[in-house]
């Protein structure tokens, strides 16, 4: 039950995280005009990974896409790549984890297969989260560097009294969304990996010892300490040992209150 809960929670947390990564990637507010200690302007600038926008105090907002690919800074391209890789890995991870969920039955899929899929999706979520965190952190570092550079030359003299003000940019909302989303995806991935350990069949093999009494046979199975008699409706559980410990779900193959479809 705990394994199912951990796996389910890991899936949900990762789903929220990946949705957040997608949202952050699409958001325009990766960097926003720094309003502190700046001359008060009637326009507000903000930039995303794909376009830059200007909101005038009149209420009019104008956004322009970065239509060039080669003319963009390498760091921006790197951030774009990291975020896209994060989204792609996360999406594949989600797809894999749906089939790996213990509460979903697909044919006669073995628990070992589900365990492998859970581990795979977990690793994908971890890498996806790391990509998002790395992307956002690279962008944030770029902003910090540019911020201090533009603070150093905040006013660029252009001869005489004429001055031109450099627009300084600070962290936008998308950075915080990205960090939180990346963290959630990472946590979800770790939870999936933990759930995988609970799903995986134990490798330790025990010799099953049968004691034959004169009346009726009772077999003792050391793994789960479950006894089964050779009589009545339980005769289909006669095969006691089959190379490793089995989960209750596998032993009791007829529907029970513990089965979720």
């Amino acid at each position: 039950m705990a394994v199912t809960a951990c796996q389910g929670l890991g899936f949900v947390v990762s789903l929220i995280g990946i949705a957040g990564i997608i949202a952050a990637t699409c958001m325009d507010q990766w960097s926003t005009q720094d309003l502190y200690n700046n001359p008060v302007t009637a326009v507000f600038n903000y930039q995303g990974l794909w376009r830059s926008c200007v909101r005038e105090s009149s209420g009019f907002t104008e956004c322009r896409g970065y239509f060039t690919l080669l003319g963009l800074p390498a760091m921006l391209q790197a951030v774009r790549a990291l975020m896209i890789v994060g989204i792609v890995l996360g999406a594949i991870g989600l797809l894999v984890s749906i089939f790996a969920l213990k509460c979903i039955r697909i044919g006669s899929m073995e628990d070992s297969a589900k365990a492998n899929m859970t581990l795979t999706s977990g690793i994908m979520f971890i890498v996806s989260g790391l990509c998002a965190i790395a992307g956002v952190s690279v962008f944030a570092n770029m902003l910090v560097t540019n911020f201090w550079m533009s603070t150093a030359n905040m006013y660029t003299g252009m001869g005489g009294m004429v001055q031109t003000v450099q627009t300084r940019y600070t962290f936008g909302a998308a950075l915080f969304v990205g960090w939180v989303a990346g963290g959630l995806t990472l946590i979800g991935g770790v939870m999936m990996c933990i759930a995988c350990r609970g799903l995986a069949p134990e490798e330790t093999n025990y010799k099953a010892v049968s004691y034959h009494a004169s009346g009726h046979s009772v077999a003792y199975k050391p793994g789960g300490f479950k006894a089964s008699t050779g009589f009545g409706s339980n005769t289909k559980n006669k095969k006691i040992y089959d190379g490793g410990a089995r989960t209750e779900d596998e032993v009791q193959s007829y529907p029970s209150k513990h089965d979720y479809v």
Epitope: A42, S52, S58, V162, Q163, Q166
Partner: antibody, heavy 117, light 113 residues
Framework: QVQLQQSGAELVRPGTSVKVSCKAS????????IDWVKQRPGQGLEWIGV???????NYNENFKGKATLTADKSSSTAYMQLSSLTSDDSAVYFC???????????WGQGTLVTVSA | DIVMTQSPSSLTVTAGEKVTMTCKSS????????????LTWYQQKPGQPPKLLIY???TRESGVPDRFTGSGSGTDFTLTISSVQAEDLAVYYC?????????FGSGTKLEIK
Amino acid sequence: QVQLQQSGAELVRPGTSVKVSCKASGYAFSNYLIDWVKQRPGQGLEWIGVIHPGSGTNYNENFKGKATLTADKSSSTAYMQLSSLTSDDSAVYFCSRRWYGNSLIYWGQGTLVTVSA
Amino acid sequence: DIVMTQSPSSLTVTAGEKVTMTCKSSQSLLNSGNQRNYLTWYQQKPGQPPKLLIYWASTRESGVPDRFTGSGSGTDFTLTISSVQAEDLAVYYCQNDYFYPFTFGSGTKLEIK
């Protein structure tokens, strides 16, 4: 069509205050900023401040304490109160609505305020 | 505050002539975010409120005759009337629409001979 209708001319005593109104029609009042501009007779234009109905105000430092901008969304009317009037406050006061580029596209007809003993 | 300097303060021309007036700001009105210059030109005829002619330094407001052209960038701006008409008799103001407080130039008075 968009219209800004200002209140009539005022003749006031020095030291008193006056409230000029600007009734907007033909557009969603809450969505646009209303600027106020002063023009002394035969002089140039001077920006007083701006109000966003329901949001906030921004004043020219030279008019802080002199002008108070308010708005009543229910009647789509902007107001400017001028206090402690002196002869320097005798001017035509315009209200105007902002447009692209923060430009002032629609103007009221102006309200002449005369401060005289 | 941004200082807007207009020149000449007045000029007298004959109908059909080309007229150029300039406006200089103490700081650049160019916004790096959208590469637009936040400078506006107004025309004020006697006894009337100002009328918007040009915004973003060069974008003509709808309904404004195409003889009015705005140009310039950064700190230096120009308003050109390609062929002056009798109805163009007015005072022309430039305005900084970028920095608060918004500031107007002292105006250029256009008179027709």
